[in-house]
Amino acid sequence: AFNLTWISTDFKTILEWQPKPTNYTYTVQISTKSGDWKSKCFYTTDTECDLTDEIVKDVKQTYLARVFSYPAGNVESTGSAGEPLYENSPEFTPYLETNLGQPTIQSFEQVGTKVNVTVEDERTLVRRNNTFLSLRDVFGKDLIYTLYYWKSSSSGKKTAKTNTNEFLIDVDKGENYCFSVQAVIPSRTVNRKSTDSPVECMGQEKGEFRE
C-alpha cells in the first residue's frame, strides 16, 4: 500500500490508500504514540478504513496507522523479515488537523435595527458520558465564527466575529440583508478555516421579524 492519507472532517475520520487490490487484501492498525496497535477493517479489499471510533476516544492524541498487505488466500504471507508487508501513515492529531465542515446558519431574528444570527452547533461523533459533543463543546473558545453580511441591494460587505454561536449586529431598518458564516480555529497553522456556509437572506424562511 502507498499514499496513505487521512481524510477527516468534524472528526469523521477515514484513512485512504492506494492501490486497488487485485490479488491481495488489507488490514489496518491504529495506535496512539504510546499505545498498543488495534486492528480494524480486517482483510478488506477496500482502499479506505473508517477510524472515527478510535480517534474520537481522545481527539487531542496523536495517532499513527499502518496498512498491512496480504496476498489473497494466504493471510500468513510475510516480508523478508518474517513480518507482513505494511506501510505507515503520516501522524494525525484530530484536534489540530480535522477539517472544519461547512457551517450552517440556523436562524436569524430581527428586532428593530438589530439582527441576531445563530450558527447551527453541529453534532460531532466525539462522545463524553455517552452523549455526542457539539463542535463548540469540543473546541470551546478555540472556535470562532466569522460572519459576512451585506445589504441585498449592495455589494459592500461587513464582517463580525464571535466565539459563541451567535452574532448580534446592527442593520438599517427597512433593508434586507444576506448572511454567510465561516468557522475558524485561530490557534491552528493549517486547516484553520471552513468553507463559507450557504448564503441566507432576509425575506426567506429562516428569518423572524419583530418590530
Partner: antibody, heavy 117, light 107 residues
Framework: QVQLVESGGGVVQPGRSLRLSCKAS????????MHWVRQAPGKGLEWIGL????????IYDPKFQGRFTISADNSKNTLFLQMDSLRPEDTAVYYC??????????WGQGTPVTVSS | DIQMTQSPSSLSASVGDRVTITCKAS??????LNWYQQKPGKAPKLLIY???SLADGVPSRFSGSGSGTDYTFTISSLQPEDIATYYC?????????FGQGTKLEIT
C-alpha cells in the same frame, strides 16, 4: 519563518494609481485573513480593509470602498492593494498584516507612498 | 461604525511608574480588543489580545483588563525601552478601528 514584505510604494501624482504588493513567506496566505493598514506621517494607524484569499471575500472601511481594491494571488502567496484616484491625504506608510482571528500577529515593514504633484 | 476613544493622547512618566491607558468603545466590542506598541519607523507589535491575554514573549509588566465598552492597558513598572506610542484596536466587527494612540515619554 513568517515574513511579510511590502513593495510598490513611491511618489505618485494626484489622480494617478498605484499598486502595492505584500509577499508572504513561511505560511500560506489562503489559511489566514490578510489586512492592509496605513499610517500618515505623524498620525495614527488606520485600517483599510481585509481579504480572505481562499474565497476572495473582501471587506473595506467605507471611506476606501470603491477607490481601493484588495486582491490576492494565492499561487504567488502575495497580497495586493490597488489604489486609484490618489489624493495628497493618501500619503502614508502602508502595512500588510496577517490576522489569526484574535489578533494581527505579523506585520510587514511598511512601504511609503507619497502623493504629490 | 464603532468609534474607539483612547486617552490620554500623550503622557509623561518616570522609570518605575505605573502607567495606565484607556480605550472606550462606542458600543460593546465583546473583548475583541488588542493593544499594540509602535516605535518610530517600525511596524506595530502586539502586546495584549482579547482584552486581557498577554502575547507570546511580552514582559509580564504589561497587562490588559476590561469588557463591554471600557478597556484599560497597564504597564506596572515603566522601563526605558517602553518609550513608544500605544494603540488599541477593536476587531469585533468591521470597519476595524484603532484608538488615536498614546505617546508615552519618560520624564
Amino acid at each position: 519563518q513568517v515574513q511579510l514584505v511590502e513593495s510598490g510604494g513611491g511618489v505618485v501624482q494626484p489622480g494617478r494609481s498605484l499598486r502595492l504588493s505584500c509577499k508572504a513567506s513561511g505560511f500560506n496566505i489562503k489559511d489566514y485573513y490578510m489586512h492592509w493598514v496605513r499610517q500618515a506621517p505623524g498620525k495614527g494607524l488606520e485600517w483599510i480593509g481585509l481579504i480572505d484569499p481562499e474565497n476572495g471575500n473582501t471587506i473595506y472601511d467605507p471611506k476606501f470602498q470603491g477607490r481601493f481594491t484588495i486582491s490576492a494571488d494565492n499561487s504567488k502567496n502575495t497580497l495586493f492593494l490597488q489604489m486609484d484616484s490618489l489624493r495628497p491625504e493618501d500619503t502614508a506608510v502602508y502595512y500588510c498584516a496577517r490576522d489569526n482571528s484574535y489578533y494581527f500577529d505579523y506585520w510587514g515593514q511598511g512601504t511609503p507612498v507619497t502623493v504629490s504633484s | 461604525d464603532i468609534q474607539m476613544t483612547q486617552s490620554p493622547s500623550s503622557l509623561s512618566a518616570s522609570v518605575g511608574d505605573r502607567v495606565t491607558i484607556t480605550c472606550k468603545a462606542s458600543q460593546d466590542i465583546r473583548k475583541y480588543l488588542n493593544w499594540y506598541q509602535q516605535k518610530p519607523g517600525k511596524a506595530p507589535k502586539l502586546l495584549i489580545y482579547y482584552a486581557t491575554s498577554l502575547a507570546d514573549g511580552v514582559p509580564s509588566r504589561f497587562s490588559g483588563s476590561g469588557s463591554g465598552t471600557d478597556y484599560t492597558f497597564t504597564i506596572s513598572s515603566l522601563q526605558p525601552e517602553d518609550i513608544a506610542t500605544y494603540y488599541c484596536l477593536q476587531h469585533g466587527e468591521s470597519p476595524y478601528t484603532f484608538g488615536q494612540g498614546t505617546k508615552l515619554e519618560i520624564t
